[in-house]
Amino acid sequence: YDFTNCDFEKIKAAYLSTISKDLITYMSGTKSTEFNNTVSCSNRPHCLTEIQSLTFNPTAGCASLAKEMFAMKTKAALAIWCPGYSETQINATQAMKKARKSKVTTNKCLEQVSQLQGLWRRFNRPLLKQQ
């Protein structure tokens, strides 16, 4: 999916008002210095591509974040403010319903959510030069 035409300001507002808080809640009890940011993004569409990948694609050691509150809100924001995004999720939703229902917080998941926090922060500062 190409995130170029999303309403970035409305997605940013949703992040600042609610998604950011859910990410913090998920990470509660973890030191902010515990994980190094290894995933980066260069512009807003690229950031959303990386955010979608880390949020919804299972990785080794972190089977699924998709049922977490921050993920549900991310999905809603993309569906509402990214043209044509919702139709790409019709089959993905069916697959998610069949997926394992239990929510397990592993160290790998914490690391992944820490990366997500970095990507979202970068998304909110699009004019900063890439380090």
């Epitope: 409305k10 008002s17 809100k73 809603a76 509402i80 044509g84 919702s86 999720q89 319903k97």
Partner: antibody, heavy 120, light 107 residues
Framework: QVQLVQSGPEVKKPGSSVKVSCKAS????????MHWVRQRPGQGLEWMGT????????DYNQNFKGRATITADKSTSTAYMELSSLRSEDTAVYYC?????????????WGQGTLVTVSS | EIVLTQSPGTLSLSPGERATLSCRAS??????VHWYQQKPGEAPRLLIY???QSISGIPDRFSGSGSGTDFTLTISRLESEDFAVYYC?????????FGTGTKVEIK
């Protein structure tokens, strides 16, 4: 079963405001956005805006920006649409309709409609 | 804003006949089109979503097709209860918009 029950008909004077309610039941309120659509007599359907409980935010059709305010009370699963500075052209049936925001993504259930008549 | 134009405005047919309703978008919207039926004094009812997906409880004589800018709703054999107004809607991008409507009336 899913039900959206709207408030009763209203007769309003030009320049005044109207607030229409839509009480939802039979599903998890925060899993769906609540959209408002209006239909003038003998005309087609016009999307006004939406409230997304999951994100606690609204979005509007620019044609109604500044005049329409869409809110919700999550504790009672009730959505509201307030339209101000009413004029005769606002005489219409106003519908609420739910739409999944993390699945389905379509207006699959509608309220019965509320007729708002604006007349001096 | 994406404009949806429906044609014809009115379709006069007899029960048992096939109805073909068209919806054209002002720009490509992939498959983000849904079809609704509305009878006088009633709220719209969802018939087809995302161009061709069927809804449980909707008779299988209703089918949808198309992608990009051209979409079609087909009613294979009209029943008496099918005479109504039909609207297409796009949810590709905000503001969501509806088509102008096609009235299917008894000939």
């Amino acid at each position: 079963q899913v039900q959206l029950v709207q408030s009763g008909p209203e007769v309003k004077k030009p320049g005044s405001s109207v607030k229409v309610s839509c009480k939802a039941s039979g599903y998890i309120f925060t899993d769906y956005a609540m959209h408002w659509v209006r239909q003038r007599p003998g005309q087609g359907l016009e999307w006004m805006g939406t409230f997304i409980p999951l994100l606690d935010t609204s979005d509007y059709n620019q044609n109604f920006k500044g005049r329409a305010t869409i809110t919700a009370d999550k504790s009672t699963s009730t959505a509201y649409m307030e339209l101000s500075s009413l004029r005769s052209e606002d005489t219409a049936v106003y519908y609420c309709a739910r739409m999944g925001v993390t699945h389905s993504y379509v207006m699959d259930a509608w309220g019965q409609g509320t007729l708002v008549t604006v007349s001096s | 804003e994406i404009v949806l134009t429906q044609s014809p405005g009115t379709l006069s047919l007899s029960p048992g006949e096939r109805a073909t309703l068209s919806c054209r978008a002002s720009q490509p919207i992939s498959i983000s089109v849904h079809w609704y039926q509305q009878k006088p004094g009633e709220a719209p009812r969802l018939l087809i979503y995302f161009a061709s997906q069927s809804i449980s409880g909707i008779p299988d004589r209703f089918s949808g097709s198309g992608s990009g800018t051209d979409f079609t709703l087909t009613i294979s054999r009209l029943e008496s209860e099918d005479f109504a107004v039909y609207y297409c809607q796009q949810t590709f991008s905000l503001p969501y918009t509806f088509g102008t409507g096609t009235k299917v009336e008894i000939k």
